[in-house]
């Protein structure tokens, strides 16, 4: 008598999540009499997937009618496949008895589930950095299968090369996750820049998923400060201007100091944006020269985005020989960031 064979013709089957999977199994003989059962996995922890005789298996249906005489096809169809269904499925023949006795197992069919990666999420650094510094961006995507996946980074459409990518777990799993960290060198022009993480996977049919992050969230462009005298007015008042240019973000506080004493504090708000995304701000201070007998030291103090304050100072020298009213005085830059204004006294 020929020995019974349990034939599982496919070593592996790959199915897209949501689809149905067909697991084929035929037996070479009708004898001995006894049921076929399907298991996922082997050993004492194996799970019963289908048993024609008893049990409720709502997602599993036999491919051919198991009740018809001389049936030797015990293939099953599992509907609405999810990544959790991945594993090795065994078709097992039992000999009828009390209880039934396991007789022969098929070689097993490995079911792998193709699952799309989640939309990539890109996160930037927790604190802002200035131009010429390198910042890290992280891209994460989860839940995909099979493990093979391609991830690319772009900055304003240009592909980046300085990144490290890990796919976890290392071994076989129902689904996988990818995490990549890219290093980006900032420039002052990056306020409007964007980094893009692009993920390509077999389940996406050539239409990769993208995640983006704006460098505006990561960059700080410190301001340039320039202090100038606008004019000497007829009433002996000097108009001093502090020009704060090319800064980002907008969060900025400006304080005028006269001889070290706070004169006025202002907060930047609702400023118009430059083409490059940075901001400019101008503040004026009127100094009554005739009210002072000694030189006046004016300081424009700017605190930007919580950083240490930056100062620019002027010395207004009170002279016995006033200059012609209405003329602009050229500000002479000294080595200490002080500018000298010679204002007339009368």
């Amino acid at each position: 008598e020929e020995e019974l064979q349990v034939i599982q013709p496919e070593k592996s089957v790959s199915v897209a999540a949501g689809d149905s999977a067909t697991l084929n199994c035929t037996v070479s003989s009708l004898i001995p009499v006894g049921p076929i059962q399907w298991f996922r996995g082997a050993g004492p922890g194996r799970e019963l997937i289908y048993n024609l005789k008893e049990g409720h298996f709502p997602r599993v249906t036999p491919v051919s009618d198991p009740t018809k005489r001389n049936n030797m096809d015990f293939s099953i169809r599992i509907s609405n496949i999810t990544p959790a269904d991945a594993g090795t499925y065994y078709c097992v023949k039992f000999r009828k008895g009390s209880p039934d006795v396991e007789l022969k197992s098929g070689a097993g069919t490995e079911l792998s589930v193709r699952a799309k990666p989640s939309a990539p999420v890109v996160s930037g650094p927790a604190v802002r950095a200035t131009a010429e510094h390198t910042v890290s961006f992280t891209c994460e995507s989860h839940g995909f299968s099979p493990r093979d996946i391609t991830l690319k980074w772009f900055k304003n459409g240009n592909e980046l090369s300085d990144f490290q990518t890990n796919v976890d777990p290392a071994g076989k799993s129902v689904s996988y996750s990818i995490r990549s960290t890219a290093r980006v060198v900032l420039t002052r022009r990056d306020v409007h820049s964007q980094v893009i993480c692009e993920v390509a996977h077999v389940t996406l049919q050539g239409d990769p998923l993208r995640g983006t992050a704006n460098l505006s969230e990561a960059i700080r462009v410190p301001p340039f400060l320039e202090v100038t005298q606008q004019s000497m007015r007829a009433d002996n008042q000097v108009n001093v201007t502090c020009q704060v240019t090319k800064f980002y973000p907008q969060r900025l506080q400006l304080t005028w100091l006269e001889n070290g004493n706070v004169s006025r504090t202002e907060m930047a708000s609702a400023l118009p944006e430059n083409k490059d995304g940075t901001y400019n701000w101008t503040s004026w201070l009127l100094v009554n020269v005739s009210a002072h007998r000694d030189d006046v030291k004016l300081t424009c103090q700017v605190e930007h985005d919580g950083q240490p304050a930056v100062n620019k100072s002027f010395s207004v020298k009170v002279s016995a020989h006033p200059k012609e009213q209405g003329s602009n005085t050229a500000a002479e830059n000294t080595g200490t960031n002080e500018r000298n204004i010679y204002g007339g006294s009368g």
Epitope: G43, G45, S105
Partner: antibody, heavy 122, light 112 residues
């Protein structure tokens, strides 16, 4: 080449909980059983229990009330927790991989960690 | 629980000579599928055990062919055709038919 590495404290006080972790590198958690086996000084091998990749656990009946084996597939690790330890729990603890090809039984414990010595003493 | 009993417990050997270890189980390890759930392990001094034989007679990967396993049901034998110096250590048989997995007491093989 699959490798297993046990980690955890070498000294545990009586009545406290012993916690060991086994890290699996170079291979997959799936389709295998992950076992803890111990060997008291100068004695033979004693199986503590194992966990299948699907999360099903099996324990030595005499230890069942004190032992928990868990699996973290994202980290490729599995762990042993043993409560209320006594001096009799002093042993070298091995983590190991057990194969299963088909059928109800198993096909050999084919990969072993190097073992970690745990001493129960106050 | 299935009880595994080994003999002898100590085995002095001569390099180049054959050696044999017996293992008996308290119930049959031959499953209805025809598979025998009996394994053999070697634990060299200061090392972890290593799998030599599984399924009663199948050699594990990388195991020299001087090791062979035989037997069926409840009586099993591990044979070393020509003992080498590196074969010293403790040999264990173990059953993998049902939980709890159980091991024999071990047979200590040492050079005469």
């Amino acid at each position: 080449q699959v490798q297993l590495q046990e980690s955890g404290p070498g000294l545990v006080k009586p009545s406290e909980t012993l916690s060991l972790t086994c890290t699996v590198s170079g291979g997959s958690i799936r389709d295998y059983y992950w076992s803890w086996i111990r060997q008291p000084p100068g004695k033979g091998l004693e199986w503590i229990g194992f966990i299948y990749y699907n999360g099903r656990t099996f324990y030595q009946s005499s230890l069942k009330s004190r032992v928990t084996i868990s699996l973290d597939t994202s980290k490729n690790q599995f762990s042993l927790k043993m409560t209320s330890v006594t001096a009799a729990d002093t042993a070298v603890y091995y983590c190991a991989r057990v194969r299963a090809y088909s059928g109800i039984g198993l096909d050999g414990t084919d990969v072993w960690g190097q073992g970690t010595t745990v001493t129960v003493s106050s | 629980d299935i009880v595994m009993t080994q003999s002898p417990l100590s085995l002095p050997v001569t390099p180049g000579e054959p050696a044999s270890i017996s293992c008996r189980s308290s119930q049959s390890l031959l499953y209805s599928t025809g598979y025998t759930y009996l394994d053999w392990y070697l634990q060299r001094p200061g090392q972890s055990p290593q799998l030599l034989i599984y399924g009663g007679s199948s050699r594990a990967s990388g195991v020299p062919d001087r090791f062979s396993g035989s037997g069926s049901g409840t009586d099993f034998t591990l044979k070393i055709s020509r003992v080498e110096a590196e074969d010293v250590g403790v040999f264990y048989c173990g059953q993998a038919l049902q939980t709890p997995l159980t091991f024999g007491q071990g047979t200590k093989v040492e050079i005469k």
